[in-house]
Interface confidence: medium
């Protein structure tokens, strides 16, 4: 029965005399008067079986002590650790010439675990063991004897097991413990590859090459290899494994990404939080599912936020010129979180009697610069039929529009070709300018060409250069433009609309808002 004692992880104990409970029962030769089994104590009051001999008075001592058979367990080289006390011959009176201060260590390989006798000739000598510390009689009085620890190794071994033997030639020795062990490189994980327990090589300089296997939920990047050194230490890790998609490295293991996290590829990266507008509901996600109403385009990386189609374009303006129409609009208020916004134009030809009966315009109509995938916010449509009602839809589209097309993404206008629109307005005046508003007034166009249905005022900050404009419509020939910024230059255009469509815009009127209220009369030229 062997008690548990703690030794380094790279040592595998084959024999430990201190852990044996009960008698060791090793074979001594001679049976009497040589080595004697003596029970002493350890610090926990547990008996330790030791072997002692002290025949220092008599010459020509040849006392042998042989262990039981020790299994090799596949080790090619084993280590023997001996802890012992040894008496200083100088402290013993009258023993000159007979007292020795060394003993000899031998081994014998055998497949037979039941050899009953010691045949000295079968044993090979490992070494002569001497003490670093020998004790005198005074030490015994002081109750202290330092233990000597000597370690020897022997190999290569080839048989199933072996016996050790201790030869005393006339010393005063107590073998307090004998431990036999071999060295291994203990099971370890490096670079996500597991390397098994590996017994060291046969000689003290050999390196054993070991191939590792990737831990669960990982895959080889480069073939993982390490070398097991003779001292039981792993050396020179080569290659590695990477955690699979949906897994990340934690303490040498590949753990599934937590809920709300993902990892798309086999890399050494950690799991990342799901991008905006997406989620994962399982552990080990390789991508995140888009929230309801949000989508990911085919070429969007898993790391990109989920996006949605844009809202409709704003402020659509049409300008009819016989069988041509110019359309202009502003960007949508909501781009859906994407940069790849473009515009498609849908042209429908509608019956005069029933505007609801509309058909596609067909291939005879031409668009400048193009009908679909427009990057600008204007288009010219030509080669329309005269005296015909047309409805034009401007669709804002992005990379995910195809997943959720909706009328909410378009704006439309209906026009009739081949009717004269009103002429442009000649004079626009700023009647009153304050910090936050401008009061405009204008005259009717010289040629209204019919009943003027409404006026449209287009204005923008001068330095915005028409990139972002606003529209105000009114039936009167004046209007108050409110919500302006103080001390800012604005440009105003006005045009009239009849049943035939819009006329051209007036010449620009530039007005700068004030810090102090004052009345300014404009004459169509710049006003400050």
């Amino acid at each position: 029965v062997t008690g548990s004692r703690v030794y380094p992880a790279n040592e595998v104990t084959l024999l430990d005399s201190r852990s044996v409970q009960g008698e060791l029962g090793w074979i001594a030769s001679p049976l009497e008067g040589g080595w004697e089994e003596v029970s002493i104590m350890d610090e926990k009051n547990t008996p330790i079986r030791t072997y002692q001999v002290c025949n220092v008075m008599e010459a020509s001592q040849n006392n042998w002590l042989r262990t039981d058979w020790i299994t090799r367990e596949g080790a090619q080289r084993v280590y023997i650790e001996i802890k012992f006390t040894l008496r200083d011959c100088n402290s013993l009176p009258g023993v000159m010439g007979t007292c020795k201060e060394t003993f000899n260590l031998y081994y014998y390989e055998s497949d037979n675990d039941k050899e009953r006798f010691i045949r000295e000739s079968q044993f090979g000598k490992i070494d002569t063991i001497a003490a670093d510390e020998s004790f005198t009689q005074v030490d015994i009085g002081d109750r202290i004897m330092k233990l000597n620890t000597e370690i020897r190794d022997v190999g290569p071994l080839s048989k199933k097991g072996f016996y050790l033997a201790f030869q005393d030639v006339g010393a005063c020795i107590a073998l307090v413990s004998v431990r036999v062990f071999y060295k291994k490189c203990p099971l370890t994980v490096r670079n996500l590859a597991q390397f098994p327990d590996t017994i060291t090589g046969a000689d003290t300089s050999s390196l054993v090459e070991v191939r590792g296997s990737c831990v669960n939920n990982s895959e080889e990047k480069d073939v993982p290899k390490m070398y097991c050194g003779a001292d039981g230490e792993w050396l020179v890790p080569i290659g590695n494994c990477l955690c699979n998609a949906g897994h990340e490295e934690q303490n040498g293991e590949c753990q599934a990404c937590k809920i709300g996290y993902y990892k798309a590829l086999s890399t050494d990266a950690s799991c990342a939080k799901c991008p905006p507008h997406s989620y994962s509901v399982w552990e080990g996600a390789t991508s995140c599912t888009c929230d309801r109403g949000f989508f990911r385009a085919d070429n969007d990386a898993a790391s990109m936020p989920c996006t949605r189609p844009p809202s409709a374009p704003l402020n659509l303006i049409s300008n009819v010129n016989e069988t041509s129409v110019n359309l202009e609009w502003s960007s949508p208020q909501n781009t859906g979180g994407r940069q790849d916004i473009s515009y498609n134009v849908v042209c429908k030809k509608c019956g005069a009697g029933d505007p609801s009966k509309c058909r596609p315009c067909g291939s005879g109509v031409h668009y400048t610069p193009q009908q679909n995938g427009l990057k600008t916010t204007r288009v010219s449509i030509t080669d329309l039929l005269a005296h015909t009602n047309y409805t034009f839809e401007i669709w804002a589209v992005n990379g995910v529009s195809k997943y959720n097309p909706s009328p909410d993404q378009s704006v439309s206008v209906t026009v009739t070709t081949n009717q004269a629109a009103p002429s442009s307005i000649a004079l626009v005046q700023a009647k009153e300018v304050t910090r936050y508003s401008v009061a405009l007034a204008w005259l009717e166009p010289d040629r209204p060409n019919g009943v003027i249905l409404e006026y449209e005022v287009k204005y923008y900050e001068k330095d915005q250069n028409e990139r972002s404009y606003r529209i105000v419509r009114t039936a009167a020939r004046n209007t108050d433009i409110k919500g302006l910024n103080p001390l800012t230059s604005y440009v105003f255009h006005v045009r009239a609309r009849t049943a035939a469509g819009y006329g051209d815009f007036s010449e620009p009127l530039e007005v700068t808002t004030n810090t102090v209220p004052s009345r300014i009369i404009g004459d169509g030229a710049n006003s400050t």
């Epitope: 004697e36 104590m41 109750r143 202290i144 005063c172």
Partner: antibody, heavy 126, light 112 residues
Framework: QVQLQQSGAEVKKPGSSVKVSCKAS????????MHWVRQAPGQGLEWMGG????????NYAQKFQGRVTITADKSTSTAYMELSSLRSEDTAVYYC???????????????????WGQGTLVTVSS | DVVMTQSPLSLPVTPGEPASISCRSS???????????LDWYLQKPGQSPQLLIY???NRASGVPDRFSGSGSGTDFTLKISRVEAEDVGVYYC?????????FGQGTRLEIK
């Protein structure tokens, strides 16, 4: 269990010698330190010397050097203490006491006197 | 030689009460291995001494836990948490760091 059985009481003349025996049982005799301690009537304890049988020779208190001899017979597990040139002040109870050797991972030391004999009264009188 | 001095030499105690005996050595009993080489013994009337405490603070096998040893270097104490009638006798401290092994002069514990 461990037992130390001492020889019987002795009456000795001044100048003579006395040899007290202590037979051990219940443990490995050779591995334990055997001490001898005496106690004069109404007095305290006085250490005389000791021996580890396996290691042969004994060591003694300076006070008794030259007058005391401690030996051990491994074959009978018996320790002996012989005191010569007896004087009246050597009248005392003589005890044998054993101390086990204790080994840690780095050293061995001798524990306290775990077991005592029953004592042998030696009277020195003319 | 190491001189051991005990106090008090006589200690009358009421049963159930605690008792404390002091022992002072003329030089340190602390070995480099961390152990204090001091033992305590009790000699009951008409009996051989018996080991109570070894190496300063370790209770010997079979000794009741009301006995405890403490101290280090040159100052040591034996404490009995609740004295019982069977605890009467002479208590000795002993140093075993170096030869000759020496004892204190003894403290006689008696019941009031």
């Amino acid at each position: 269990q461990v037992q130390l059985q001492q020889s019987g009481a002795e009456v000795k003349k001044p100048g003579s010698s006395v040899k007290v025996s202590c037979k051990a049982s219940g443990y490995t005799f050779t591995g334990y330190y055997m001490h001898w301690v005496r106690q004069a009537p109404g007095q305290g304890l006085e250490w005389m010397g000791g021996i580890i049988p396996i290691f042969g020779t004994a060591n003694y208190a300076q006070k008794f050097q030259g007058r005391v001899t401690i030996t051990a017979d491994k074959s009978t597990s018996t320790a002996y203490m012989e005191l010569s040139s007896l004087r009246s002040e050597d009248t005392a109870v003589y005890y044998c006491a054993t101390a086990p050797m204790v080994c840690s991972s780095t050293s061995c030391y001798l524990r306290g006197f775990d077991y005592w004999g029953q004592g042998t009264l030696v009277t020195v009188s003319s | 030689d190491v001189v051991m001095t005990q106090s008090p030499l006589s200690l009358p105690v009421t049963p159930g009460e605690p008792a404390s005996i002091s022992c002072r050595s003329s030089q340190s009993l602390l070995h480099s291995n961390g152990y204090n080489y001091l033992d305590w013994y009790l000699q009951k009337p008409g009996q051989s001494p018996q080991l109570l405490i070894y190496l300063g603070s370790n209770r010997a096998s079979g000794v009741p836990d009301r006995f405890s040893g403490s101290g280090s270097g040159t100052d040591f104490t034996l404490k009995i948490s609740r004295v019982e009638a069977e605890d009467v006798g002479v208590y000795y401290c002993m140093q075993a760091l170096q030869t000759p092994i020496t004892f204190g002069q003894g403290t006689r514990l008696e019941i009031k």
